[in-house]
């Protein structure tokens, strides 16, 4: 969720933005997971070795660590500039963003970098804004922010109601979880009063780390090292390496080529989740990891030192064979999940296309007029119109309808940017499937 300042369409009426939620920042709750294949073990070791050199690029260093104080310039590649830069209006230069002030996450042709989000009171800064990544804000301990009410952090409940037991702790993105003692079914909805409660301090694990846990951890680490040494020394290495390259290039893509249309920085997938879970938390700088829900089942977006500003290309052949359907990553309601993303669309769709887009989506001129009048400011107009569209069309208001309308208007760039944004926000993921089985 990128908060635009410098290139916001208008200064007034700017809708409040939050930094990325937990899905964007950290992925699932911590906890050891067992690797499924030998390849993952090998990949873990490989990534462990390359993690330090690969993950920190010059743009991510604090100002005092960088060579030159002035804005760095380089030449655009195919009319685009790398993450951490924006393009000059004449298209001749890539100008670096200012550390701690603004950023850009993708290869882009932005005329200005995006302004860094400032965390609200009641939030802690999980990782600072660098030139390639926005600030990551998280609710303070004892509070959480739900997917469907992202405006503010709410206090976690201190315990479960009578007849229920706690099965999940308060996390920055979820309240405590309670289930009925007998049925084991989850409790949903607010509890009027906490009676017989089972309390625990917010954010603490349900059970402390036991001796057996430590033993398992040490054993797994030892096995990883032994297997890695064996693989490195054996001929198996030659067989495994191409497979790993396949994973890292998005399943067969050429790692030398850069995908300029579907990068999702920070959107590491399940494979990476598996790998990260093997590593000690300190071995990969946490703020650099940004593990997210899967966007696609392949494609580990780890950056090699030589191409630290580039992201690798997914298999083009696969893309052309099947229409990739966007579905909510958390199996939530598609229309509601889409609605949560509207806030950012004003930054992605050129202002001049707002009204044509809404007409294409079925809003009447008078409905557009009303939406404009209702909007808190220029900045909010598209948001208000999109909400009107959802209210009018209900379940038929699908992400694909929106993207198709942009395509029809010739706004392919905006369409791509929205698609990228939906994926990198962690709210949507690709479901490979046929066009006729399209889901919203």
């Amino acid at each position: 969720m990128e908060q635009r300042g410098q290139n916001a369409p208008a200064a007034s009426g700017a809708r409040k933005r939050h930094g990325p939620g937990p899905r964007e920042a950290r992925g699932a709750r911590p906890g050891p997971r067992v690797p499924k294949t030998l390849v993952l073990v090998v990949a873990a070791v490989l990534l462990l070795v390359s993690a330090e050199s690969a993950l920190i690029t010059q743009q991510d260093l604090a100002p005092q660590q960088r060579a030159a104080p002035q804005q760095k310039r380089s030449s655009p590649s195919e009319g685009l500039c790398p993450p951490g830069h924006h393009i000059s209006e004449d298209g001749r230069d890539c100008i670096s963003c200012k550390y701690g002030q603004d950023y850009s996450t993708h290869w882009n042709d932005l005329l200005f970098c995006l302004r860094c989000t400032r965390c609200d009171s009641g939030e802690v800064e999980l990782s600072p804004c660098t030139t390639t990544r926005n600030t990551v804000c998280q609710c303070e301990e004892g509070t959480f922010r739900e997917e469907d009410s992202p405006e503010m952090c709410r206090k976690c409940r201190t315990g479960c109601p009578r007849g229920m037991v706690k099965v999940g702790d308060c996390t920055p993105w979820s309240d405590i979880e309670c289930v009925h003692k007998e049925s084991g079914t989850k409790h949903s909805g607010e509890v009027p009063a906490v009676e017989e409660t089972v309390t625990s301090s917010p954010g603490t694990p349900a059970s402390p780390c036991s001796l057996s846990g430590i033993i398992i951890g040490v054993t797994v680490a030892a096995v990883v090292l032994i297997v890695a040494v064996f693989v490195c020394k054996s001929l198996l290495w030659k067989k495994v390496l191409p497979y790993l390259k396949g994973i890292c290039s998005g399943g067969g893509g050429d790692p030398e080529r850069v995908d300029r249309s579907s990068q999702r920085p920070g959107a590491e997938d399940n494979v990476l989740n598996e790998i990260v879970s093997i590593l000690q938390p300190t071995q990969v700088p946490e703020q650099e990891m940004e593990v997210q829900e899967p966007a696609e089942p392949t494609g580990v977006n780890m950056l090699s030192p030589g191409e630290s500003e580039h992201l690798l290309e997914p298999a083009e052949a696969e893309r052309s064979q099947r229409r990739r359907l966007l579905v909510p990553a958390n199996e939530g309601d598609p229309t509601e999940t889409l609605r949560q993303c509207f806030d950012d669309f004003a930054d992605l769709v050129p202002f001049d296309s707002w009204e044509p887009l809404m007409r294409k989506l079925g809003l009447m001129d008078n409905e557009i007029k009303v939406a404009k009048a209702e909007a808190a400011g220029h900045r909010d107009t598209l948001y208000t119109m999109l909400i009107k569209w959802v209210n009018k069309t209900g379940r038929d208001a699908s992400v694909h309808t929106l993207l198709d309308a942009l395509e029809t208007l010739g706004e392919r760039l905006a369409k791509q940017k929205i698609e990228d944004h939906l994926l990198s926000s962690g709210k949507f993921m690709y479901l490979e499937g046929n066009a006729d089985s399209a889901m919203s």
């Epitope: 290139n7 100008i95 042709d109 005329l111 392919r412």
Partner: antibody, heavy 123, light 111 residues
């Protein structure tokens, strides 16, 4: 409402300098390049150059490189164009215009213009 | 520099008829799959007003009577039907390459 308010008409002597202002309101000043355009009496339009209000970076039409200096004052959301060594050839209406694009691929179009400043160079 | 030629300096059209104004560039103004050609209307004593951006996109608040077409080097602004209020000078402008340049203008008059 986006507005670009330019300074009033000016009558200056040859050889002198003049500074024309363009005060922006109704939008994020540092989020859009500002351009300057010259229109001599009864003639077409000529692009003078651009200024990036965020960092003061400039780009000029070679023809005006030694004639115009483009600057900005961020706190007051104002762009300035100073014209030096004035001659009668510099008598014209000068416009400031905002680039409405956010992405370069949007096409760099001038969506809002100031009302124009008439400059007369005469002894 | 890219030279823009508006071959018809003035054009007289009857009310309710179609007006077609052309603009030819000395080299392609296409980039990013878009044409960086824009059309402006200017009335006496007023600043230019954006009508069409990127060759064919109608600026917000401009009547649908105005339309733009073309790519690479040949572009057309069409006004259909022409109204009395359309009497003005029309300029094409390219922003694909520095220095940005304008056409010489086409003055539209009513027959």
């Amino acid at each position: 409402e986006v507005q670009l308010q330019q300074s009033g008409p000016d009558l200056v002597k040859p050889g002198a300098s003049v500074k024309i202002s363009c005060k922006a309101s109704g939008y994020s000043f540092t989020g859009h390049y500002m351009h300057w355009v010259k229109q001599s009496h009864g003639q077409s339009l000529e692009w003078i150059g651009r200024v990036n209000p965020n960092n003061g970076g400039t780009g000029y039409n070679q023809k005006f490189k030694d004639k115009a200096i483009l600057t900005v004052d961020k706190p007051s959301s104002t762009a300035y164009m100073e014209l030096r060594s004035l001659t009668s050839e510099d008598s014209a209406v000068y416009y400031c215009a905002r680039n409405g694009a956010y992405y370069r691929s949007d096409g760099n179009y001038f969506d809002y213009w100031g009302q124009g400043t008439t400059l007369t160079v005469s002894s | 520099d890219i030279v823009l030629t508006q071959s018809t300096p003035s054009l007289a059209v009857s009310l309710g008829q179609r007006a077609t104004i052309s603009c030819r560039a000395s080299e392609s103004v296409d980039s990013y799959g878009n044409s960086f050609m824009h059309w402006f209307q200017q009335k006496p004593g007023q600043p230019p007003k954006l009508l069409i951006y990127r060759a064919s996109n109608l600026e917000s608040g401009i009547p649908a009577r105005f339309s733009g077409s073309g790519s690479r080097t040949d572009f057309t602004l069409t006004i259909n039907p022409v109204e009395a209020d359309d009497v003005a000078t029309y300029y094409c402008q390219q922003s694909n390459e520095d220095p940005y340049t304008f056409g010489g203008g086409t003055k539209l008059e009513i027959k």
